[in-house]
Interface confidence: medium
């Protein structure tokens, strides 16, 4: 079950793993989704009644029984890791945390004007995972405007104080904002003679580069494969740092892979292993055995049960019961098999608790004004808003984000007094097929964002709360909403889809449309709309020359965009001067800028 | 390694002026505020002047001295210098020229082997 | 402007002794608190940053302590070339830096 809720003047007792400094209980939270065996955490903020030396401690947590005793206790603040979970998750912090000094090793101190300018310096630094900041205030001359640049072995700070006049924060690499080079290569027969700073095994080498990447000190790592001459280094892989950033020597050796961290690509990196490795044993601590038909199933098994980190599905005769075969549950303390071995009658892989990996990600069948038709199935997510007074007809689109939640526009709602007349279809390819016994969804609320006036000014989103749970099937299942640490990704692969007009004057259209469309910058987009302010809050999507578009109807349904393939719901039709007019881009609702308050309402209690 | 050599000390009578130099090598002086630092006979350590870094403008004196000495630098000749004008018996000291380092705290981590003034009739 | 106090002003101990030397500011200065030592006729070297980070070089018998306004400087085990005059300096609130007035550390 997932918990985001955050529990005031409670501690959780025992289960002790860690105990790491964070600057806040939302980022202890974080930290803890990231350990390969927290499932909850107790974090001290700063109180009068408090020890100094124990504020802002997260102290991360484990239970078998994935809960443990509450007690209450003034300035404490429990909660449960992300892993329980579907939505995404992301590392990307760009909180500043005022006159907070987190400490580390500071291996660089410059001038910088501004914490921001601290900050991008912390960004674009290869060892950089966080820095403090001496504001002009400070009481020290020679401090003021000194930007620190500080890591450590964990990432996270050894220790934090409060100090006048400082601010602090944390390298924004996971919101894929760095300017350093990204080398996604992988050097087969190279090895990276520098320093180890941790080793684990992995099954390849695509594996071994992920862990590199989520790792705190990793800069870049060697793999030996299955074929590595040194039995003893089979599958182990090598993570790796050096002083510059970069491998000092470089060695020919057969067997071998070597790579780079991902930490500063613009994009994000899974933290999963989705792969399934047939005839390959993953041991590890053993969590639970079960029979189940099939190794896709054992993946699922894994990845609902909350501690499982990795499993094997046997097949040997002696682990068969009717068409089931022996599914292995196991774990170990930093979430990599303790060993593996080859040339079984078994395939192993990880749980994909961490890729949030949920019924929005599952992927799609492959594959609006100048659109063309969708086939059944192609937009699951995609529904049809109707209002049936004074008569019945299409309202809006919305996509399906939860299996009780619609997200959709909020001007839609415009003279719209109550639920009761909305229904909402799922699942439908043509509007004809919508007749008076269809099976709908009845509206229990809708919550339109609160500081919404009109299109134009922003704040164009609203939650449909249905009256009954969607089951998830192929025509009907939700879509991700985007990560956070995803705001500075470049979506190339975006689509707008409706019911709506395909020119100015025309009506409803039947069958769903859709239309590639490319995503224009918001600079951009300012310029085509002089007489509005484009806020960071709305994105932009059109082609210069017209001709493909959202127009009236299609409001409220979705801008989506495949990135990873995987589909996010990266806008919400919003407005636009005209349809499909000639450097007239569409403006959607800037979905990411929402997730929060989409999360708030969605979970609120 | 880090050096700096100071020179230009040596007996001046009352009012008259001085001009202490150091010498910097081992770093990138540029980059670096920079000290005088002083020691009266058998006293312990008061600190001078500093011009930092950053800033050209920002250049800072004890009270003691303020409107007599003046911290100057040459950093495309990796100098820094002292101009002590209208001495008085008091200046009377060891000035030691230091590199300030910013370790968490600022701190002056090397230091010169000092330049002996004396102001004397 | 921040006045920074030490004591004792001198003091005598043997090779081997635990030593502690302290310092009090006016005022609160976090840690941003050095410490030097200087020997007779040469320049001051520093030796505790930060209140308790040891410069590198620095033998591990000196430690430092504190936060706010008291410090101290500890020698675990006094070694011959230890006997030298300490300062304590605050780079807190600046300009001006201050120094404590010294403690002597001489053989008994």
């Known amino acids: 079950e997932c918990v985001t809720q955050l529990l005031k003047d409670t501690c959780f007792e025992g289960g002790d793993i860690t105990t790491v400094f964070t600057p806040s209980a939302k980022y202890c939270q974080v930290v803890c989704t990231y350990h390969p065996r927290c499932l909850l955490f107790t974090f001290t903020a700063e109180s009068p009644s408090e020890d100094p030396t124990r504020w802002f401690t997260c102290v991360l947590k484990d239970s078998v029984t994935e809960t443990l005793p509450r007690v209450n206790r003034t300035a404490a603040i429990s909660g449960y890791s992300f892993k329980q979970c579907s939505h995404q998750i992301s590392a990307c912090n760009k909180d500043i945390y005022v006159d907070l000094d987190m400490k580390g090793i500071n291996y660089n101190s410059s001038v910088a004007k501004s914490a921001q300018e601290c900050q991008e310096r912390c960004t674009d630094d290869v060892h950089c995972h966080f820095f403090t900041y001496a504001t002009r205030q400070f009481p020290s001359l020679e401090h003021r405007n000194i930007c620190l640049l500080k890591h450590t072995q964990t990432g996270t700070p050894t220790r934090i104080t409060k100090l006048d006049k400082v601010v602090s924060g944390f390298s924004l690499k996971s919101c894929a904002l760095s300017n350093l080079a990204c080398i996604r290569d992988i050097f087969p027969n190279t090895v990276f003679a520098d320093s180890n700073i941790d080793s684990v095994m992995a099954p390849d080498a695509f594996v071994c580069g992920r862990i590199c990447t989520h790792h705190p000190g990793c800069l870049f790592f060697t793999f030996f494969s299955q074929e590595w001459p040194k039995e003893s280094q089979r599958n182990l892989c090598l993570l790796k740092t050096s002083e510059s950033g970069l491998p000092s020597t470089r060695i020919k050796k057969s067997k071998a892979l070597s790579g780079f961290s991902l930490q500063s690509c613009r994009h994000s990196i899974p933290v999963c292993h989705s792969k399934i490795y047939p005839g390959v044993d993953f041991g590890g601590e053993e969590l639970n055995v079960t029979f189940v038909k099939g190794v896709n199933v054992c993946q699922e098994t894994c990845t609902k049960m909350i501690r499982c980190q990795f499993f094997t599905y046997s097949l040997l005769p002696e682990d068969c019961k009717e068409e089931k075969g022996k599914c292995f549950l196991r774990l170990s303390m930093d979430g990599s098999p303790t060993r593996i071995a080859y040339g079984t009658q078994g395939s192993s892989g990880y749980s994909l608790r961490l890729c949030m990996d949920n019924e929005c990600t599952t992927k799609i069948k492959p594959r609006i004004v100048g659109g063309t038709a969708s086939v059944r199935g192609e937009w699951p997510w995609q529904v049809t808003l109707h209002t049936t007074s004074p008569t019945q007809r299409h309202l809006c689109g919305g996509s399906i984000i939860g299996n009780q939640w619609i997200l959709t526009a909020a001007h839609c709602f415009y003279g719209v007094e109550s639920p009761k007349i909305l229904r909402v279809y799922s699942g439908i390819l043509n509007q004809s097929e919508i007749k008076e016994d269809t099976s709908f969804f009845g509206v229990q609320e809708i919550i339109i964002h609160d500081q919404y006036k009109m299109a134009e000014s922003g704040y164009d989103i609203a939650l449909l709360k249905l009256e009954t749970t969607v089951n998830y099937t192929d025509s009907q299942r939700p879509i991700c909403l985007p990560s956070k640490g995803d705001r500075n990704v470049i979506y190339t692969d975006c689509w707008v889809t409706g019911w709506g007009y395909r020119k100015l004057r025309d009506k409803i259209q039947n069958t769903l449309q859709k239309a590639k469309i490319p995503l224009v910058t918001n600079e951009e987009c300012q310029k085509r709309y002089r007489g509005h302010k484009i806020t960071h809050k709305m994105i932009c999507a059109g082609y210069r020359e017209g001709g493909k578009d959202a127009c009236k109807g299609d409001s409220g349904g979705p801008l989506s965009c495949k990135h990873n393939e995987v589909w996010h719901l990266v806008g919400i039709t919003s407005w636009g001067e005209g349809c499909a007019q000639r450097e007239r881009p569409g403006v959607y609702t800037n979905v990411v800028e929402y997730v929060d308050w989409i999360l708030e309402k969605t979970q609120a209690v | 390694q880090v050096q700096l050599v100071e020179s230009g000390g040596g007996v001046v009578q009352p009012g008259r002026s001085l001009r202490l130099s150091c010498a910097a090598s081992?770093?990138?002086?540029?980059?670096?505020?920079m000290h005088w630092v002083r020691q009266a006979p058998g006293k312990g350590l008061e600190w001078v002047a500093i011009?930092?870094?950053?800033?050209?403008?920002?250049?800072y004196y004890a009270d003691s001295v303020k409107g007599r000495f003046t911290i100057s630098r040459d950093n495309s000749r990796d100098m820094l210098y002292l101009q002590m004008n209208s001495l008085r018996a008091e200046d009377t000291a060891v000035y030691y020229c230091?590199?300030?380092?910013?370790?968490?705290?600022?701190?002056?981590?090397?230091w010169g082997q000092g330049t002996l003034v004396t102001v004397s009739s | 402007d921040i006045q920074m106090t030490q004591s004792p002003s001198s003091l005598s101990a043997s090779v081997g002794d635990r030593v502690t030397i302290t310092c009090r500011a006016s005022?609160?200065?976090?840690?941003?608190l050095n410490w030097y030592q200087q020997k007779p006729g040469k320049a001051p070297k520093l030796l505790i940053y930060?209140?308790?980070s040891l410069q590198s070089g620095v033998p591990s018998r000196f430690s430092g302590s504190g936060s706010g306004t008291d410090f101290t400087l500890t020698i675990s085990s006094l070694q011959p070339e230890d006997f030298a005059t300490y300062y304590c300096?605050?780079?807190?609130?600046?300009?001006?830096?201050?120094f404590g007035q010294g403690t002597r550390l001489e053989i008994k």
């Open positions: 230091a590199k300030s380092e910013i370790l968490v705290v600022p701190t002056l981590d090397y």
């Open positions: 081992g770093f990138t002086f540029s980059s670096y505020n």
């Open positions: 011009f930092l870094s950053y800033d050209g403008s920002n250049k």
């Open positions: 005022q609160s200065i976090s840690s941003y």
């Open positions: 930060a209140a308790s």
């Open positions: 300096q605050q780079s807190y609130s600046t300009p001006p830096i201050t």
